[in-house]
């Protein structure tokens, strides 16, 4: 509520706005009859410098002129860009207890003259839009700077708008509020931007343009697609555009894709036929427009149209495999398995599969539809059987895939040789083989099939298989391969009407088993001891067991035990040993060995042979 300048005045020379690097003189003068009441000679004027309302300096030592008790002049230098506040105060030196009294203050602004505006760019959005121009102002002036945008054109057309920049707002764009119409398409227009502040002024170079240079069409709207005869691959894309548009760019892609299909369409008039779409696929479509074939700018992309193409009948062939087992004296169970079509082959939602089993000579046919990817039937063991499967969606069915039902491992001469299985990493196994040595018919293909060596349901846990061309002798199997599980792998060689196979076990990663086999019984027969055991539970095997070891030593002996190593066969659960002395008590135990090492020992059993050993 105090009038700060009641006691005196503050003036600045040469001006309150100065260029960067300049000095200024600030004079502080007391009004008549103002000052320290009793002793005018004790009047002391001080000048304080504030930046952002913070006192940064007392300019006591910068006095250049002093009329004692009346006025003082201070020189200020090295002022930083922007605004600095100076406050003059009166200090009555005889009264130490009273704080200095404000006399008056002044703001000095330090800045630079504006640079000529550059890179002027003008646009008019749509045929009915208005012209707006933007520019680069150059270096910040730190002063209030006025900008004037002037447009001139044919028929004495002139127009101008103004705006200013300061420390709160930036002016580098102005909308002139006028519309250029297409009938001025060939006319030339000139714009210039002038910048003025307290330290100077500058003008841009004139910027010349035509209607076509600056008008950006509005993006197309109301996009839709019509599929001809509900086709999944052909559709007509339609949209609305501004009247003057002569060129469109279309882009479209499946939603999970990373690259667009691009199409240029001239004089499309809001319609374009697409012929290479993928059926039953989610697509995204966008369109952009241009007013002139060679000049002008493209509009922004339209909003996306997202839609799914209709279904078409499936294409491609199903990958079929089978398993057959004799289930009584004159019947066999055929379990057919097939892999789902990939989306580009299914071309729609697969509703069911049509399965046919046919006995070729007697013309017996079993037919069924199923929604599963397997089908099981009991048929006579006699006759030559063939199976076919096709996939159906709402538009139709794929061509049936045929397979001859042969005895897959029936022909020894067709058995592949030197089958090996090597772990490649945690989740795959490399299987290699050599072709059959004396095949009496040509190998049409190899099938590599694998199953976990764990109890499983025949239908719930279908086989995994790979089809391999006849000139390939290796396969990398990875589907459903888990570490620490042993797989039985079969390589089938198939001719037109026969099959031969070879088996091997393999794992992708192994550890030593958790435990050894459990000895269940020791029996003596014909001067030999038979050791019987139960196998290690599957989860504890931790890979393929290569062999078992039976250890024995005399009870209480500190000698190393003897051992017998036997090849692992799941079907074997007993083994004879014949090097034990009669009427000597022995301790026996077993271990299991994988490629990673030996298990801890299983249970110990004591036994004292009675008969004559050896």
């Amino acid at each position: 509520n105090i009038d700060v300048c009641k006691l005196g005045t503050v003036t600045v020379q040469p001006a309150p706005v100065i260029p960067l690097g300049s000095a200024a003189n600030i004079s502080c003068s007391l009004n008549p009859k103002q000052g320290c009441s009793h002793y005018p000679s004790s009047n002391e004027l001080i000048l304080l410098k504030f930046v952002n309302d913070v006192l940064v300096e007392n300019l006591h030592g910068k006095k250049v002129h002093d009329h004692t008790g009346h006025s003082s002049t201070f020189q200020v230098t090295n002022l930083s860009l922007g605004m600095t506040l100076f406050v003059c105060k009166l200090n009555c030196s005889n009264s130490q207890k009273k704080p200095p009294v404000p006399v008056c203050g002044v703001e000095i602004s330090v800045g630079v003259a504006p640079e000529p505006p550059q890179n002027i760019s003008c646009v008019q959005e749509g045929e009915n839009g208005t012209v707006a121009c933007s520019w680069n102002s150059g270096k910040v002036t730190y002063l209030k700077t006025n900008y004037t945008l002037q447009l001139s054109g044919p028929n004495n057309l002139t127009c101008q708008k103004q705006c200013f920049s300061d420390n709160r707002q930036n002016c580098n764009r102005l909308d002139l509020g006028i519309n250029l119409s297409p009938d001025l398409a060939e006319s030339r227009f000139i714009v210039r931007v002038t910048a003025i502040n307290d330290l100077g002024n500058s003008s841009s170079l004139p910027h010349t343009f035509t209607f076509l240079d600056i008008v950006i069409p509005l993006p197309p709207w109301d996009i839709r697609i019509n599929f001809l005869n509900a086709s999944g691959s052909r559709g007509t894309l339609q949209w609305e555009d501004e009247g003057q548009v002569v060129l469109n760019q279309l882009r479209y892609q499946p939603l999970n894709s990373t690259s667009w299909n691009m199409v240029n369409a001239t004089n499309a008039k809001g319609k374009y036929d697409l012929r290479d779409l993928r059926p039953f696929t989610e697509y995204e479509f966008q369109i952009s427009s241009k007013l002139h074939l060679s000049g002008g700018s493209w509009s922004n992309w339209s909003e996306s149209l997202r839609t799914r193409t209709p279904e078409e009948e499936p294409v491609g062939i199903l990958d079929i495999w089978y398993m057959k087992q004799d289930i009584d004296y004159d019947r066999q169970q055929i379990s057919l398995f097939w892999k789902s079509l990939n989306p580009s082959e299914a071309r729609g939602k697969i509703l069911h599969y049509q399965v046919t089993l046919q006995e070729v000579t007697k013309k017996t046919t079993l037919q069924n539809t199923t929604r599963h990817t397997s089908w099981t039937r009991v048929i006579p063991r006699t006759g030559a059987w063939t199976a076919s499967v096709s996939a159906a969606n709402s538009k139709g069915a794929s061509a049936p895939t045929h397979i001859n039902i042969v005895d897959l491992c029936g022909t020894g001469l067709l058995a592949p040789h030197q089958v090996s299985a090597k772990s490649e990493n945690m989740d795959n196994i490399l299987v290699t083989w050599q072709p059959p040595k004396k095949a009496d018919s040509a190998v049409r293909e190899y099938i590599v099939e694998w199953r976990a060596l764990q109890p499983g349901s025949i239908t719930k846990f279908p086989p995994h298989w790979l089809r391999i061309p006849p000139d390939n002798m290796s396969a990398l199997i990875s589907e459903n391969i888990k570490p620490y599980i042993c797989y039985e792998i079969r390589v089938h060689a198939l001719s037109e009407s026969q099959g031969g196979c070879s088996s091997i076990r393999g794992d992708s990663k192994h550890k030593a088993p958790v435990s050894g086999p459990h000895i269940t019984a020791i029996t003596e027969k014909k001067e030999r001891l038979f050791i019987s055991w139960t196998h290690i539970p599957f989860p504890e095997q931790r890979g393929c067991i290569l062999h078992y070891r039976i250890y024995w030593k005399e009870r209480d002996s500190t000698a190393q035990p003897e051992l017998c190593e036997i090849q692992y066969r799941r079907s074997q659960n007993s083994h004879p040993i014949s090097s034990l002395q009669p009427r000597v008590t022995y301790v026996l135990w077993m271990t299991a060995v994988t490629a990673a090492g030996e298990s801890p020992q299983g249970n110990e059993r004591e036994f004292c042979p009675q008969g004559k050993a050896n």
């Epitope: 199953r451 109890p455 499983g456 349901s457 025949i458 239908t459 076990r505 799941r570």
Partner: nanobody, 119 residues
Framework: QVQLQESGGGLVQAGGSLRLSCAAS????????MYWYRQAPGKQREFVAY???????NYLDSVNGRFTISRDNAKNSVYLQMNSLKPEDTAVYYC?????????????WGQGTQVTVSS
């Protein structure tokens, strides 16, 4: 190991019905494919019906339409409903479970239950 126990057999007149039951116990976590077989005196054992994990069923031609196989997973049981019985259906009926380990098929059998159809 898997244990199977059949029940429900007996003497019935031609045209009558019986319902056989088979209860499974033991290591049955991987048993999904269940079968009924029968063996008539002086003949070989023959397949009658099976039911898969996905409840797909298949029958011997001569019993198709008269016999129905079903299962109750909660009770670990499989059933054979036999209607319009004929004297030639007389046999010991066996429950069978198959599971696969690698490519080897392990089979488990029950003790059998006698079905006699009188004319």
């Amino acid at each position: 190991q898997v244990q199977l126990q059949e029940s429900g057999g007996g003497l019935v007149q031609a045209g009558g019905s019986l319902r056989l039951s088979c209860a499974a116990s033991g290591s049955i976590f991987a048993i999904d494919d269940m079968y009924w077989y029968r063996q008539a005196p002086g003949k070989q054992r023959e397949f009658v019906a099976y039911i898969t994990a996905t409840n797909s069923a298949n029958y011997l031609d001569s019993v198709n339409g008269r016999f129905t196989i079903s299962r109750d997973n909660a009770k670990n049981s499989v059933y054979l409903q036999m209607n319009s019985l004929k004297p030639e259906d007389t046999a010991v009926y066996y429950c069978n479970a198959k599971q696969i380990v690698g490519f080897q098929i392990d089979e488990y059998w029950g003790q059998g239950t006698q079905v006699t159809v009188s004319s």
